[in-house]
């Protein structure tokens, strides 16, 4: 059994920031879960992780240098990304894993969201690929 994920097909990031809402066919209340956002058709870059442990405080982190935060709804996680660069325009996929209670569940791959970054004044050097893996 797989969780279904709904995302907006496209979002425009004005001012280098965007809110991306991942809506699930599953209630995350009182669950231990790991929600993540992945960049690229192959989902190669894990942009942001939101870890929830029952009703406790969410733990938010990025191993790839993205500035992010997460907000939890009953059946959604909203990722807020900041300081995006124009060359980070790409398709972004929501992923969800429910670790507890059993059984372990994850999602069917969603259609993804194209985030189009319209930078206001940021002009990073062409050599800068955006936040990189440490």
């Amino acid at each position: 059994n797989k969780i279904l994920v709904k995302q907006s097909p496209m979002l425009v990031a004005y001012d280098n920031a965007v809110n991306l809402s991942c809506k699930y066919s599953y209630n995350l209340f009182s669950r231990e879960f790991r929600a993540s956002l992945h960049k690229g058709l192959d989902s190669a870059v894990e942009v942001c992780v939101v870890y929830g442990n029952y009703s406790q405080q969410l733990q938010v982190y990025s191993k790839t240098g993205f500035n992010c935060d997460g907000k939890l709804g009953n059946e959604s996680v909203t990722f807020y990304l900041q300081n995006l660069y124009v060359n980070q325009t790409d398709i972004y996929f929501c992923k969800i894993e429910v670790m507890y209670p059993p059984p372990y569940l994850d999602n069917e791959k969603s259609n993804g969201t194209i985030i189009h970054v319209k930078g206001k004044h940021l002009c990073p050097s062409p050599l800068f690929p955006g936040p990189s893996k440490p």
Partner: antibody, heavy 122, light 107 residues
Framework: EVQLVESGGGLVQPGGSLRLSCAAS????????MHWVRQAPGKGLVWVSR????????SFADSVKGRFTISRDNAKNTLYLQMNSLRAEDTAVYYC???????????????WGQGTLVTVSS | EIVLTQSPATLSLSPGERATLSCRAS??????LAWYQQKPGQAPRLLIY???NRATGIPARFSGSGSGTDFTLTISSLEPEDFAVYYC?????????FGQGTKVEIK
């Protein structure tokens, strides 16, 4: 006047615990993200942790993840840092700092408290 | 994470002289760079944010410039109270990181 005042520092043995507090005044505390930044004796500044305005999400430096927790009481205008499994390398002055702008995480730190010294030694 | 390298480590100058402090990032941080001043026994104080914007109450003798990887803090004419340690900090990438500091001391 915007003011942040830390307390709770002191001498603790390796493996021990300590809880730092930061009392805020002069601004609407519940509107701002808050941070902890530390400075080992004679060294530079290192970001430790942040918490969002309503306390529902937090982030940590890798060096303290799993050992430190951050929380806030918006009714009391107070920020906390619970430090467990302390190590000698956690010895530092711990500063609380407010995010410069309300409503989001801009990660400019302004203002700062005066700091509280945590010494981890046997 | 992004590494910020400040130079020089120590700057020995006299009051009235111009101070030029450098901060170099290991990769582009666009204009997401700030400067802080810290005096002995005191907390840091935000001077400049977004590379060139002076924080509230900061005198006009402090100015910031640069973008991408190279940034400069300039103190046009040093006052006695300006002798301190100065740190740069980036918020472009997670986590926020600081430079190791430049000490401006009296010659």
């Amino acid at each position: 006047e915007v003011q942040l005042v830390e307390s709770g520092g002191g001498l603790v043995q390796p493996g021990g615990s300590l809880r730092l507090s930061c009392a805020a005044s002069g601004f609407t505390f519940s509107n701002f993200w808050m941070h902890w930044v530390r400075q080992a004796p004679g060294k530079g500044l290192v970001w430790v942790s942040r918490i969002n305005s309503d306390g529902s999400s937090a982030s940590f430096a890798d060096s303290v993840k799993g050992r430190f927790t951050i929380s806030r009481d918006n009714a009391k205008n107070t920020l906390y840092l619970q430090m467990n499994s302390l190590r000698a390398e956690d010895t530092a002055v711990y500063y609380c700092a407010r995010d410069r702008y309300s409503g989001s995480f801009y990660n400019w730190f302004d203002p700062w408290g005066q700091g509280t010294l945590v010494t981890v030694s046997s | 994470e992004i590494v910020l390298t400040q130079s020089p480590a120590t700057l020995s100058l006299s009051p009235g002289e111009r101070a030029t402090l450098s901060c170099r990032a290991s990769q582009s941080v666009s204009s997401y760079l700030a400067w802080y001043q810290q005096k002995p026994g005191q907390a840091p104080r935000l001077l400049i944010y977004d590379a060139s914007n002076r924080a509230t109450g900061i005198p006009a003798r402090f100015s910031g410039s640069g973008s991408g990887t190279d940034f400069t803090l300039t103190i046009s004419s040093l006052e006695p109270e300006d002798f301190a340690v100065y740190y740069c900090q980036q918020r472009s990438n997670w986590p926020p990181t600081f430079g190791q500091g430049t000490k401006v001391e009296i010659k």
